[in-house]
Structures are given as structure tokens and as C-alpha cells.
Amino acid sequence: RPSRVYKPEGNTKRALTLKDILNGTFSYKTYFPNWISEQEYLHQSEDDNIVFYNIETRESYIILSNSTMKSVNATDYGLSPDRQFVYLESDYSKLWRYSYTATYYIYDLQNGEFVRGYELPRPIQYLCWSPVGSKLAYVYQNNIYLKQRPGDPPFQITYTGRENRIFNGIPDWVYEEEMLATKYALWWSPDGKFLAYVEFNDSDIPIIAYSYYGDGQYPRTINIPYPKAGAKNPVVRVFIVDTTYPHHVGPMEVPVPEMIASSDYYFSWLTWVSSERVCLQWLKRVQNVSVLSICDFREDWHAWECPKNQEHVEESRTGWAGGFFVSTPAFSQDATSYYKIFSDKDGYKHIHYIKDTVENAIQITSGKWEAIYIFRVTQDSLFYSSNEFEGYPGRRNIYRISIGNSPPSKKCVTCHLRKERCQYYTASFSYKAKYYALVCYGPGLPISTLHDGRTDQEIQVLEENKELENSLRNIQLPKVEIKKLKDGGLTFWYKMILPPQFDRSKKYPLLIQVYGGPCSQSVKSVFAVNWITYLASKEGIVIALVDGRGTAFQGDKFLHAVYRKLGVYEVEDQLTAVRKFIEMGFIDEERIAIWGWSYGGYVSSLALASGTGLFKCGIAVAPVSSWEYYASIYSERFMGLPTKDDNLEHYKNSTVMARAEYFRNVDYLLIHGTADDNVHFQNSAQIAKALVNAQVDFQAMWYSDQNHGILSGRSQNHLYTHMTHFLKQCFSLSD
């Protein structure tokens, strides 16, 4: 046959288009096994069958067919621990960030049919199996119900539930968003005997009300009990009920530690230690003191006792307790001692082993880096993630400490697996860490693999995104660099996304993408093809993300620098970085912009109003404009209270409105969803009012009935198209 003439590929690759981004053309997949034992897991296949896998026997079969799923339009499932039943979840209806309601059907795997009689009410706010057997706990209309078996009539555990007033087993808005980060507030004991839950009383909390326009003649009003900074907070109580005979004693209240109960406080988390031991974490309203309380069930008293000598206090003298949240304990097999991440004497968050008192804690990890999460503690190993490797704060590697050895030996499980491709991992462990899955998020294409928990040997590739790899072959992707810059005694890590044919001798427009919130991190070694990737690829814009003071995992000195003075250093450090980027020689000083969303919208607004003349234009999406408008738990964690004798002055000084005059010389695009339950539209309304009062011209866009994520497909298309036009106009880029 005729020989092929070899043609060098040349530049046949195309740039990314905005359409690619909006259609999610280059989205990646991850694979998290749904572990059901030491060596077995379930996974939902591409065609929606629920497949059972046994790693050791290599057996796999469909445990629940897609036709059964489809028969009730199920989008999720949950297998009972005795493997006799599966709940099927359908009619998913999102509420806030984590919460949603749904309809649940129980399928009997033995009979191959749905359980009839005493069907679950709808819609249910939360449902879960007990850890043993097939008891069901669920929340309906803010009350908790229990079923001893799926076919049994339910037992009502709580009677106090009332819409927008009292929540049992589910958090109210502020606890869901700012404290628990879950849709649930109930926890089974390991043997399924006890059920712990929280009651949130919001009766005295002020209501945020906003219009939801819908399609009707009249808008409806959404009312949410939402404590803003300094307002009355939810009153929380923790109860435990014996699910064997719940009707006998009824729910038993767990006492709050005296040093916590003496003033306003929060419940922060609950961890079951054993079948009759529970660990509760509490936090003072002024969030620099956290108390971990270990409570035991006293059979003779039929009560939960929390002795004072089982209270462990964690206090920060330089800022707030914990990172974003106070860390949770990982208990040892002895059900007494535990491992926990908190700041060491040098202000770096590290793993400590607590046997009796926090004062006598043994530090397990140390160094000028931070331990981030404890995944699992087994008889002989502790698995955790950190950003230690090669000194890059934006990496995540998984480490194993052999706690059986003295001294404990440390091994990095992931550091050298796929070094170029993978520098940011998370993990998912089977019951006693006999096996685990690693999910790598980048910087290369994400990949999920299965490993032996003893040898760390890779057993199988679960997902390697081959299709994505193939479809990206003909795309001109930008080059991504993660580096650091120094200013005075400070080091700032940044990520720069450079256009495909980047030439240092040329000048490029610069867009700063900022978040900058306390204990956040933007400079991460992760893969992404998103709007800013497109801007670099197609529009030739240099993008930079900078982690300034207040961001996470670089020690408390860096983190707590913003304590009680939000809106100062976060902005200053973005400005410093821009000046450094200009010095690099390839930035067109006349074409620099900044944009951010949420906290990033706050920082971008303040940066634009800094009066430096560095920015030509900028965008703020759903910005906070005053910390008095935001949630109590968040605002007060970092700012204290907006009272005269506390920090009212800085609350007032740090508003966007206070700097309205300074927007005169920049092009400002202000965007907000009118149904934002999180950062209320009020924030942008007040910015707009202040700009109008100051006679400052600006652009604005609202998204009717959209929340903080502006997530609806149509709105998102419009949003990114609109922002693209704005930027291209600002940078004088042809359409």
C-alpha cells in the first residue's frame, strides 16, 4: 500500500471556547468506592446499575438493576448494613448548601420487591440506616422518626419540631452552612443501640426575608431564621435516645460543660467512640475556646455522664480555635486516647496524641507545614494528609504513621506514585483500612486507584479519564505555574495560568482571580478546565491566583494575621502581588483586572476601591459588603462582635460602602442572585445604593431567583457570557 507522507502536526490544536466550558465538555470523573466491608464496595455504573465488588474474590455483580432504580426515578441509594434492604432516593429537591428533601422507597433485596405498608412520608429531610441491621432513622417536618424494620410503623422520637422554629436531627441554616457542613444532625452509635441528635431552637432568631418571583402574579416571600453578626443565635441541646425501647426513658439530654454553658455557645460536632461512649465538641460564642467532652452511659443511672476530668480544652491566643472548623478527634482502639490536629507551639497545625490531658499531649507530626486531615486510625497505622512534601502548601499527600512502632515511623504513601501527574490527593478507606482508594485531583488529569492497605501496593486503576485525555489532545491548554514571591518577610504562593503561546517578551492583560477568605486556599495543585482556563487559552489573558495572609495551611502567624481586621491584609497582599507581577515584565499595566465571588467579591471590590490605580476594571459576584450583614458564626469567628466594647469600629471601617467614592476611576461590574440565602442580595443592594449616592457610575446584573451559586444552566451561561464581554471590553479584545 502507498506509504503515508509524514506531516508534522504543526498548530492543528484549537483553543478552548466559552461553549466548551459552559457545556462541561472537559469535565473529569472521580471514583469513590461505597465501602460496605473490609474488602467489598458498591459503585454506581455509567448505566446506573448498582454493582457489588469483592476485591479479594474479584467477584462483581449487579446488586440493584438500573430498571429498579428507574422504576422510581431514583438518583441515589443506600444499602442497609444487613444487606437485606436498599433505600432508593428520588425527587431530589435542593434546599441550602448541603440540605435537600427527597422521596424514599425501600427495596427488599430478598424478595425483589418494594416494601409495602407503612411507606415513608414525603418529602423526607434526612434518612439513614443504623450501622448494624436495618433500623431506619429519618427526619420529617423537623421531627425524628424511627423504624425498627423497614416494614414497621414508625416511632416518633421528637414532637417539638416546627418549621423555621425548632429543628430536630437536622441543622438550621447557620449550623448547616457555618458549623456542621452537613444536612444532618443525628448520629447512630456504632452498634445501633443509641441515636444522638441535636435540637436547634430558632424561635428568637431574626428572620431574613426575600422575594422569590417564580411565575405567579405575586412573588412569594422566603423566610429563614438567619442570625447575622451580633444577633440572637440558635439554642442547641443534644439528646441521646435508646432505640431499642425509645418510648421508655425518651430522649436523654447530654449536659453541656460548665465552662461552656456560662455564656453563649455552639455545639460543634459529635463523635461516637464506642457503643456507650460519645464525644461532644462545644465552642464558646467568642470562638477561641473549644471544649471536647467525653461522655459515658451510666446503666445504673440510665443517664449520660460527662465527667470534668474528661473535658479537654483547646484555646487559641492568637486568633480563633481550629482552622475553618475545629478539628474532630480520631479515637484509638482503646476508646480513651485520641489523635487530633491543633496548633503546636510554633503555630503550625499538627497531629497530637491525647491520652489524658491536652497539656500532656504528645506531638506526632511537626515542621513548618501542616497536617490537614486524619483519615483513619487502625490498630497499627494512622493515615493522614499534609502539605509537607517539597514545601508546597497547595499540595496534598497521604502519609501513614506506624503507631505500633516506637518511635512511630512515617511513610509518604503518595509522594512518588505519579509525581508529575499527581500532587493533590484524597483517600477513601475500607472499614479497617484493609484497602483504600486514592483519588488524585491533579495537577495532571485526575486518576482514581485502589490500593492494599498493608503494602500500599496499587491493585487497580478505577478511573483514569482516558476519554478526557483523548479529547484534550487537540486543545491548546494554557501553561500553569505554581511559584512563590517574597515581599519583606512574607511569602505568597501564586498560581499563574499563561496563554498557550506565551512569550515573556510580550505584554499580556492580567486577570486576578481572588477568594482570600480566612482559612481558604486558592493556589492548589489541581487540574481544572474552567472559565479562567478559557480566558488564557482563547483570549490570551494571563490569570493569577494569590494566597495572601489569612489563607490556610501555612501556620497561624499567616492565618491569624487577619483576625479582627478582615478586609485589610487580604487586599493589601493582592495589590503587592500585582506589583510583583508587573515587575516580571510581561504584564500590560494598562490592562489589569480583578474578579471574585462571595468573599472574593468582597476582596475584589475593596481592591478596586483601594485607590492605587492598579486595576482598570473588576467584577464582584455575590459579594459580602459588610460583615454585619453576614452570618454570626462566620463573621464573629474572625471579627468578634459588632459592639462598641468589642469590634464595631472595624465592622464599620471594613465595608465596601465606606469606599464608594474610590470606585470612580474603575469599571465595576456588580452581580448578585436575588434569592441568595447565604450572602443576601442586601449586600449588593447596599453597595449599589452607596455608589448611586456617591454619583459613581457602575455596571450591575442581577439574576432573578438565583442563589449564591447562580447555578441554573441558563443563568450560568448568561453570567459567564456577560463577564466575558465585560472583560474583553475592558481589555480592548475584539469579539
Epitope: P153, F155, H247, V249
Partner: antibody
Framework: EVQLLESGGGLVQPGGSLRLSCAAS????????MSWVRQAPGKGLEWVSA????????YYADSVKGRFTISRDNSKNTLYLQMNSLRAEDTAVYYC??????????WGQGTLVTVSS | EIVLTQSPGTLSLSPGERATLSCRAS???????LAWYQQKPGQAPRLLIY???SRATGIPDRFSGSGSGTDFTLTISRLEPEDFAVYYC?????????FGQGTKVEIK
Amino acid sequence: EVQLLESGGGLVQPGGSLRLSCAASGFTFSSYAMSWVRQAPGKGLEWVSAISGSGGSTYYADSVKGRFTISRDNSKNTLYLQMNSLRAEDTAVYYCAKAWMGPFDYWGQGTLVTVSS
Amino acid sequence: EIVLTQSPGTLSLSPGERATLSCRASQSVSSSYLAWYQQKPGQAPRLLIYGASSRATGIPDRFSGSGSGTDFTLTISRLEPEDFAVYYCQQGHIIPPTFGQGTKVEIK
């Protein structure tokens, strides 16, 4: 040994009030929900009211809702039932019992309430 | 509310005989929440069975309970003289807790 001792019963006119007490001993009173159960002469048992161990939650039968109030003083190990607007049909022996909704594992000896003009 | 109907209303038996008492619920009750009590004249009720089939402390093994759903049974295998009394079933599944109207076991 668990003991429950009711007191406060007696004769009262319709529309009148009475306060029953139940002194508890032999167990950690504050840990347990407690109930009042009554028995009209020659009739069966009827649950009247219950209160959680901490006293934070109370429950009532429809027949007494709005008229009776259950309370407890954990420092005194005592359960109370305040009965207002009494009617002839409230005539019964009132027992205090240890439990929320059952099983009622310990009962007092009962106190007789007679509502009559 | 759940209505519990006991049958028979009266059971006339001799000591040594077997007594079978029935309790029917107007709607299904999880067995965990069903109890039986014994009451003698002038005395407070005494718990016999909880969880439909578990004997309370100190209750002799001639007393046994069974059943599920809507039908429950209390059985006294061999009646002793002290067993002649009124027996009540009770559900604690749904507020308000309710009692059956009672079955009187009398000496024949």
C-alpha cells in the same frame, strides 16, 4: 429500691384546682421521663401526661390539654401535676409512673381525686 | 390514637389451667412498644411483659408474650392462685400511649 409516693388528692368542686405531687427515690430521677396515669372508679387505665427527664418537653392527653400542667423539680426528686378547671369526669385514682410512653416499670400507690359538688 | 381491644372481657379458669389473653390494635404496633400489666384490686398496676415478649424483672416464666403487628397475646401457662387479676395491654408506639380496656381473669 425504687419508690414513688403520690400525694395531694382529695375532694374538689367542679371548676376547682388541685396539685398532685409524686416523691421519687431509689433511682436517678432526673434521668427518667415520668408520667401520670389515671383510673376512674371501676374503669381501665388512661395515660394523662408525661414529662422528659430534664423537664424541657411535656406531653398531654387531649382530654386534659390546656387544663393540666405537668412539671418536675429534679433537685427535690418530685413530679407534679397541676389540675385546673376540674370536671366530674376527672374523678380517678392518679398514679405517677416511671417512663415516657411505656413500659411503665414502676408505679406509685395512687392518690384519689374526687370532683363533685 | 391507637385503640387496643382486649378479649375476652372476662376469662373464667381454674388454677393450673392455661390462660390466653388477646390484644388487638387498631393499627400496627412495633412489638418493641407493646407491654402487659397485671392489676389486683386496690393495688397499682405491675409491669409483666415489655417489648411484646420480654419478661420484666422478677416475673415468673409462666408468663409469656407473643405477637406482632396488630395481634398480641399474653399466655399464663399454669395459673397460680395469685394470678387472678385484671390484665391490661398497653402500646407506647404513638402518643398518646393507650391501654386496652382490660381482661379479668377470675377463678372458675
